[in-house]
Every structure is written in C-alpha cells, then in structure tokens.
C-alpha cells in the first residue's frame, strides 16, 4: 500500500514572495499543496484541515490559526476554527470560504491543506428475519482469554451497549463527531442509529457470535444515523484514541475503522502516526468494486485493509458493486450474511454484509493473537495474519483482469495455535503503484519500518521494462522498477520479511563485457544470498546465448544478462540459511513457477534470462512466478526458454528460540 497515490486531485499553489505582513515568512520557494477528494459528491467544501509541518508545536498551530483568522477578517471574511490538532498531526480544522485557500497556503508552517470529505459505513443490511446466532466450531482455536488482554476501539455509529451480545464488553466513550443527517424527513430512531456499530461490536466480541469473545471494546461515534461521517471527524477520533493511550497506557490496542471515503492524504497520515505509536489499525477495503487504493483509510500502508468474501470464498457482490480489491488490500475475510447483534432489541440478531464485517472479523482475530502474544508488533501481526490465511481459495476471475495479480488471494483464518509460529521466517509480497507509461517512469515498493527488504523484482504487462534494483532511500532499502520506451508501465515488487538482527546490503556488478553474462555474489563472511535483481539501460534486452547457467556449488551468486547490471541482496542474521531452487522449461511457456519446500520461506524470485519476452517475476505466498509473453508471439525458439529462480531461506536461530520458549 502506498499513501502517495490514488485517483486524487492535487492543486499546488506556489507561495508568493510578498508575505502579507507575516512575522514568520516560510522558507523561500517552498510549496504548500491543496488536496480534495476525487469523488465529487463526497466533497465538503467550506471545511478544511490545515496540516502543519511535522515538528510544529501546539502553540505554533494556535498562532497560525489565529493569524489566518486575522488576515481573513482584514479581507472581510469570517472564519471559524473548529478544532486544533495535536497529539497525532499538528494542524487545525477551519470553516472558511474557499477564496481564502491561497492565503492559507502561504501561512508559516503549513505543509498542506485538505478539503474535508465524507466517509461511509461499509455494510448493507441483509436478512430481515430474526436469526439464531451460531457458535464458533469447537475445532477452531480459542485461547482461554479470547482476546481479554486487548482493547478494541470502534469508530462507527452509536451502539446499543445493553444488547445481550455486548453488554459489559463495550464501553461507550463520550466521543461524538458526526455530520447532520441528509434530508428533511429524517427522524432519529435509536435502533436505526445504532444498527451498524452494534452489529460490528457483536462480530468482534459478541458472547455468541463474536470472534474474540474476551476482548473489551470502546466505541467512538464518528458516523451519523445514516452511516455517514467526515474525514475531519475521523481524524479527531483517532487523535482522541492517541491521547487516551498517552494518558492511560494499557495493553495492546486495536482500532477498527469500518468506514471508507475517497483517497485522503491527511487521513492516511493520521493512521500512519497512530500505527507508528504501536496501535494496530484494521479497516474496511470498501464496497465499491474498485481499487482499494482509491479510498481511505484503505489505502494507508500501515493499516490492515480487509476485503470481503462469502462462505464459498468468492468475493462479495453487493448488487452492481461489491468488495474492493487490489494491492492495497492485505487480505480478505468473511463479509457476506454475517450474523451479529441487531439494535432492534437487546436479544435480536441480524445479518449484514460488507467489508465492514470482514474488517471486524480480522480485528477479532488480531485481538486474539495479541492477547496470546502481547508483544507482537504491527509488522509481526500482519505477517502472521497473512501466514495463517487460507491461500489461493478465491476465484480471481471476479476481479478485473489487471487487478488479479495485485490482489492477495488470502482469506483470514484463526491460527491453529499461537505457539510454534515463532520459528517461522515470515515474508510477504508488496506491490508498488503502477509507474505510468512515460519513458523514464519508475515504481517504488517499500517494506514496513520493521521489515527487511530481502529481494526486489519487477513486472510489466507489455514486457517493456528495464528491470529493477534495490536502492537506499531515507536509510532504508526500497525496490525500484524501471519502465522502458514504449512500455505501458511497470510494477516494483518487494519481498518484505521479518528478520530480527539482520544486516543486509546490496552488491552490484555492472554489465559484463564477456558473453557469459553478468555475475555477482555475496563475498562477506556469514552473508547469504536472499534475492537477485537485474537492471539494464538498453531498451530491448536481446536474446542471450549461450544461456546463463549458475555454476554448481556457487549458491551465493546472482547471474544475469551480460547487458544488465546485477544486484545481489546479501544478509547476515543469526542462523539464517538460504538455498537457490530453479525450475527451467525449455519450451516457451506463459508461466513458470518454483516453490520452496515446507519449512523454507521464499525470499527471492527472479527469472533467467532477463530477456525482453519475460514480463517479470513475483512471489505469491511461497511460490516464485515468472510470466512471459503469450507463447504465440514468442514462437518456440530457444528464446522462449525461461527459468524461474527461487531463493528459499529459513532461520535456525528463530527455530531454536521457539524451542527454548516451549
């Protein structure tokens, strides 16, 4: 998930030098930007979140807000400061005319301004009839405490806290920030107002139908009786949680955001800050049958984004719409006809559908995992959720063709037991945003802060690409893929792993003069090869003959086309061992795969040779997939022969540590 993309409008207003009598003029040439929701009907013009630069103190925020008011008044405009943010993001919420935006963007400390916009509950009511709640099957793992060490915050509608399912389990906070309901005939009816939140609270921790029956919950009201809220209200809710966490630190916190709006830079930024403060955020992917990257908070990389599947493991269809999909989704979970508490009466049950219900499932699973292992970081939790998911059960034909490769084929499941997972080397695949088609376009895939980038690959549907390489950015390795002239664009694919005490570096060999191809190996003592990448400057990497072969007994070596520079990812970590596994097919084939054996984890995936008919390589769970152009276009010459190269690793150190714990 990337938080800098999205079908998102950005209006950049360059700052002028005349500073309108400001005491503190911003640095010369800096540019504050204005953002608004790309979904026009969801825009809320007239209310703006002014986000200040990261190190801005509360007093400076207040001073900047007052300055805006004073300057607006001099121009004859009324403004109202609705809220001053601190704790998560510095800034303020202001009600003002859009005419003042240019003025506001010139204020000192301003980073960007975002117009407020709507967010919506992501459920639809389903069966009308009253239902008897199911009980989870006895064969599913239920820790004795059922998530009791964890607190789950629910940002949603109001809830019926005296419902038998959730009575005594949910504490209703005094937080409320909701917009007026639409329409003139709307009558607030408690059962309607409480419907969405009550159901979700029941799915997370309900006595009968809940996933984490021991989890305690706190509810914040950010959605009105029609299931509608605002980005600003959600931000203030997230800030409330952060302040509560600081005032009274408790055990692990899970925040459930069963809502979605258009892509929002500020909402994603707030989620990032909260996640980096140790909070696990789980959100609905959205019910728009669309790319989840176009919605927030679904597109925030730090948030666990959940799509919805039904009992047959098919993506949920909701009329013409349905679950969102794409690279910003982390995994799917049950989201159709989900039985939970109904606000119609204190013993009623109802079923609802949507990605909200799917997210509530995952929040419940997360609560149970955190209760069993309270020290888990967000990265460790996400990797475990992925690891224990059911793999390759979703019918991908439901997704648009261009999204199938990007969408994770994972359905969340409770772990069979929380012990015995510690020895595993966990890895996941992270896809970048699409680079776009320009000649020099690049795409960047990043791992989470506490993950290691162990390999980097690239993929282009047209096959026109110039490979990929790992490079340092802000003190961390990232994976960058390069488009080629005439290409429709590329993706970068990072393999992100949990490898404690790792020391990784990239070794590069420039294009070789010799015809045998380019080679590079891990020459440092104790370093093992975890991934190979290749990058070339020529537009079309020709057929490479003789074919590149890895010399036997040299597993720590990357090999590639003689016109390409080759990059080896070399890591040292206690007990880390890796091996190379290859699967070559002499005849042309659209897809070649090679998988790591049980107990080994795929860290690297690449293709040999890197010629232009290879579309790219990527990891799907523990399998390395190499895709080539349609066989009919390549013919069955030796150029069609492709080898998939997997690097499989395991950590004896992690295994030993796990055995010692047991």
């Amino acid at each position: 998930q990337e938080d800098e993309d999205g079908d998102y409008e950005e209006l950049v207003l360059a700052l002028r030098s005349e500073e309108d009598g400001l005491a503190e003029a911003p640095e010369h040439g800096t540019t504050a930007t204005f953002h608004r929701c790309a979904k026009d009907p969801w825009r809320l013009p007239g209310t703006y979140v002014v986000v200040l630069k990261e190190e801005t103190h509360l007093s400076q925020s207040e001073r900047t807000a007052r300055r805006l008011q004073a300057q607006a008044a001099r121009r004859g405009y009324l403004t109202k400061i609705l809220h001053v943010f601190h704790g998560l993001l510095p800034g303020f919420l202001v009600k003002m005319s859009g005419d003042l935006l240019e003025l506001a963007l010139k204020l000192p400390h301003v980073d960007y301004i975002e117009e407020d916009s709507s967010v919506f509950a992501q459920s639809i009511p389903w069966n009308l009839e009253r239902i008897t709640p199911p009980r989870y099957r006895a064969d599913e793992y239920q820790p004795p405490d059922g998530g009791s060490l964890v607190e789950v915050y629910l940002l949603d509608t109001s809830i019926q806290s005296d419902h038998r399912e959730i009575e005594g389990r949910v504490m209703v906070t005094d937080f409320e920030n909701v917009p007026e309901e639409d329409g003139t005939r709307f009558h607030r009816q408690a059962s309607k107002c409480d419907s969405h939140g009550t159901h979700l609270a029941g799915v997370v921790s309900g006595r009968d139908a809940g996933v984490a029956k021991g989890a305690s919950m706190r509810s914040l009201r950010v959605l009105n009786c029609q299931g509608k809220g605002t980005v600003s209200g959600t931000l203030i809710g997230l800030e409330f949680i952060r302040k509560s966490q600081l005032v009274q630190p408790v055990g692990p916190l899970v925040v459930l955001l069963p809502l979605a709006g258009g892509y929002s830079r500020v909402l994603n930024a707030a989620c990032q800050r909260l996640a980096r403060a140790g909070v696990v955020l789980v959100t609905a992917a959205g019910n728009f049958r669309d790319d989840a990257c176009l919605y927030s908070p679904a597109s925030a990389p730090e948030v666990i984004t959940v799509g919805a599947t039904n009992a047959q493991d098919q993506p949920v269809t909701l009329g013409t719409l349905g679950t969102n999909f794409g690279r910003c989704v982390d995994l799917f979970a049950p989201g159709e006809d989900i039985i939970g508490a109904s606000s119609d009466c204190s013993t009623c049950f109802v079923s609802q559908s949507g990605t909200s219900q799917a997210a509530a499932h995952v929040a419940g699973i997360a609560a149970m995992m955190l209760s069993a292992e309270p020290e888990l970081t967000l990265a460790e939790l996400r990797q475990r959720l992925i690891h224990f998911s059911a793999k390759d059960v979703i019918n991908e034909a439901w997704f648009p063709e261009d999204q199938r490769v990007l969408t994770p084929n994972l359905v969340a499941a409770l772990p069979p037991s929380t012990h015995g997972a510690g020895w595993q080397l966990f890895c996941r695949t992270v896809w970048s945003a699409h680079s776009g088609p320009t000649r020099m376009a690049t795409a960047v895939a990043r791992c989470a802060p506490d993950e290691e980038l162990l390999s980097c690959s690239s993929f282009s549907r047209s096959g026109k690409r110039r490979g990929e390489r790992m490079e340092a950015q802000g003190g961390k390795l990232v994976c960058r893929a390069h488009n080629a002239f005439g290409g429709e664009g590329v993706y970068a694919i990072a393999r992100c792993c949990l490898l404690p005490q790792a020391n990784c570096s990239v070794h590069t060999a420039p294009p070789a003069e010799a015809s045998m191809g380019t080679r590079v190996h891990c020459h440092q003592q104790g370093h093992v090869l975890t991934g190979c990448s290749s990058h070339w400057e020529v537009e079309d990497l020709g057929t490479h003959k003789p074919p590149v072969l890895r010399p036997r007994g040299q597993p720590n070596q990357c090999v590639g086309h003689r016109e390409a520079s080759i990059h080896a990812s070399c890591c040292h970590a206690p007990g880390l061992e890796c091996k190379v596994k290859e699967h070559g097919i002499p005849a042309p084939q659209e897809q070649v795969t090679v998988a790591c054996e049980e107990g080994w984890t795929l860290t690297g995936c690449s293709a040999l040779p890197g010629t232009s008919h290879v579309l790219g390589a990527y990891a799907v769970d523990n399998t390395c997939v190499v895709r080539s152009r349609d066989v009919s276009t390549t013919g069955s010459t030796s150029e069609g022969a492709v080898t998939a190269v997997a690097i499989c690793c395991r950590s004896r150190h992690l295994a030993q540590a796990s055995q010692e714990l047991q």
Epitope: D40, P41, I124, P125, D182, G183, T184, K192, G319, L321
Partner: antibody, heavy 122, light 110 residues
Framework: QVQLVESGGGVVQPGRSLRLSCAAS????????MHWVRQAPGKGLEWVAL????????YYVDSVKGRFTISRDNSKNTLYLQMNSLRAEDTAVYYC???????????????WGQGTTVTVSS | QSVLTQPPSVSAAPGQKVTISCSGS????????VSWYQQLPGTAPKLLIY???KRPSGIPDRFSGSKSGTSATLDITGLQTGDEADYYC???????????FGTGTKVTVL
C-alpha cells in the same frame, strides 16, 4: 435472478388517482434505494422519484411534487407510487429501478423493470 | 426541459467509433457521478456506465465513459449493429435535489 415487475398501470381520467406497484425479487430489497422513472411516448427518460433504502428520505421531480408519493414496504419487497390529481402530461411508461448502492443515492440505477403504461385521458 | 444536453443523433459504420457527449453544470455533472444507459428499441433502459467510468460486469469494454469538468462522454468502439439504440446520460443534481437524465442520443449503425 434479480427482477423488478411493475403493475397498476391503466387508463385513467384527468384528476383521478392511480397506485403503481413494483414487486422486487432476487435481491435484498431493503438494502437499496429505489426510483421511479417515466418515459412519455416518443420522448426521453424523465426521473420521477427516489426513496432511500429505509424509507427515511424521499425526493421528487418538481412537476409531481405534492401530487405523487413514493413509498415502500420492505417486509413485502414492494415499491409503490401513489399518483393523485393526474394530468394528461403524466401519460407515460413508468419504470421502477433499483439504486446502485445503499446510501449513495446519486450513483444512478442498475436494475430496471419492464415498465407499466399509464394513460391519462378523458 | 432537460438540464443535460446530448446530441440528438450520431452515426458510424460497423467497426468504427462513436462519441456521445453530455453537457451539464457544476450542480450536476461537475459535482456528481455520471451514469450512462442504453435503451434498445421497445425495451427498458440498461446501465452501461456508473461512477463516470466504471462498467458493470457483463458490459463489454467497447463501452467506456469519462468525465471532465461539467461534461461527460461515452465512447463506443468497434460499433456493432446491435448497438443501435438510444443512449442517455444521467446524474444527480444537487441544486434540484433530483436525478436528471440527458436529452438522449440515437445511435445509428450505417
């Protein structure tokens, strides 16, 4: 499969009333906003009215405000259009149509009935 | 009087491309989602495009929509005889609090 079937059309004199019904099947009726749309002979489509999934909000085209009432019975999976003080210009085929998504009433309509004909003539 | 304006008719030979425009204002197209509907002779309308550019499942990718400012466009490529129909744009109008349809465009395959 998803189906909308209109009924209640017919020939009526100006000033009189008529009630149209639309029976929904194959989907969860109570989860969707519903619309009435009409089409006069040889003319284009004209939107008439919308009701939210839970009946909490209704909207009408100006020309029928105060004369027509849209309502629904979610327990019967049925949409209604009560038409009073009918005029010659109300003569049209009336379609009921399902809104694309709950709460996003501005999305448009994805499922249409076959229509029922209303003729207002003396 | 419709608030969305479309050309009364467009025509092209089989296999060719036709473009239908829909012009409105900031209170409708400018700030709302646009849908396109196809009405074959003697039948009910059918949804072709929603949210300005998205196709429901089952609608071929020969049909595509776009929106810019206060105008929307429907493109039909690889025109087929079965595409002969009336096409309507539609959107919510925030100032009227009403859904509005375009005047309609008749597509003829030569």
């Amino acid at each position: 499969q998803v189906q909308l079937v209109e009924s209640g059309g017919g020939v009526v004199q100006p000033g009189r009333s008529l009630r149209l019904s639309c029976a929904a099947s194959g989907f969860t009726f109570r989860s969707y906003g519903m619309h009435w749309v009409r089409q006069a002979p040889g003319k284009g489509l004209e939107w008439v009215a919308l009701i939210w999934h839970d009946g909490s909000n209704t909207y009408y085209v100006d020309s029928v405000k105060g004369r027509f009432t849209i309502s629904r019975d979610n327990s019967k999976n049925t949409l209604y259009l009560q038409m009073n003080s009918l005029r010659a210009e109300d003569t049209a085929v009336y379609y009921c149509a399902r809104g694309i998504a709950v709460a996003y009433y501005y999305y448009g309509m994805d499922v249409w009935g076959q229509g029922t004909t209303v003729t207002v003539s003396s | 009087q419709s608030v969305l304006t479309q050309p009364p008719s467009v025509s092209a030979a089989p296999g060719q491309k036709v473009t239908i425009s829909c012009s409105g204002s900031s209170s409708n197209i400018g700030n709302n989602f646009v849908s396109w509907y196809q009405q074959l002779p003697g039948t009910a309308p059918k949804l072709l495009i929603y949210d300005s550019n998205k196709r429901p499942s089952g609608i071929p990718d020969r049909f595509s929509g776009s929106k810019s400012g206060t105008s929307a466009t429907l493109d039909i490529t690889g025109l087929q005889t079965g595409d002969e129909a009336d096409y309507y744009c539609g959107t919510w109008d925030s100032s009227l609090s009403a859904y509005v349809f375009g005047t309609g465009t008749k597509v003829t395959v030569l």
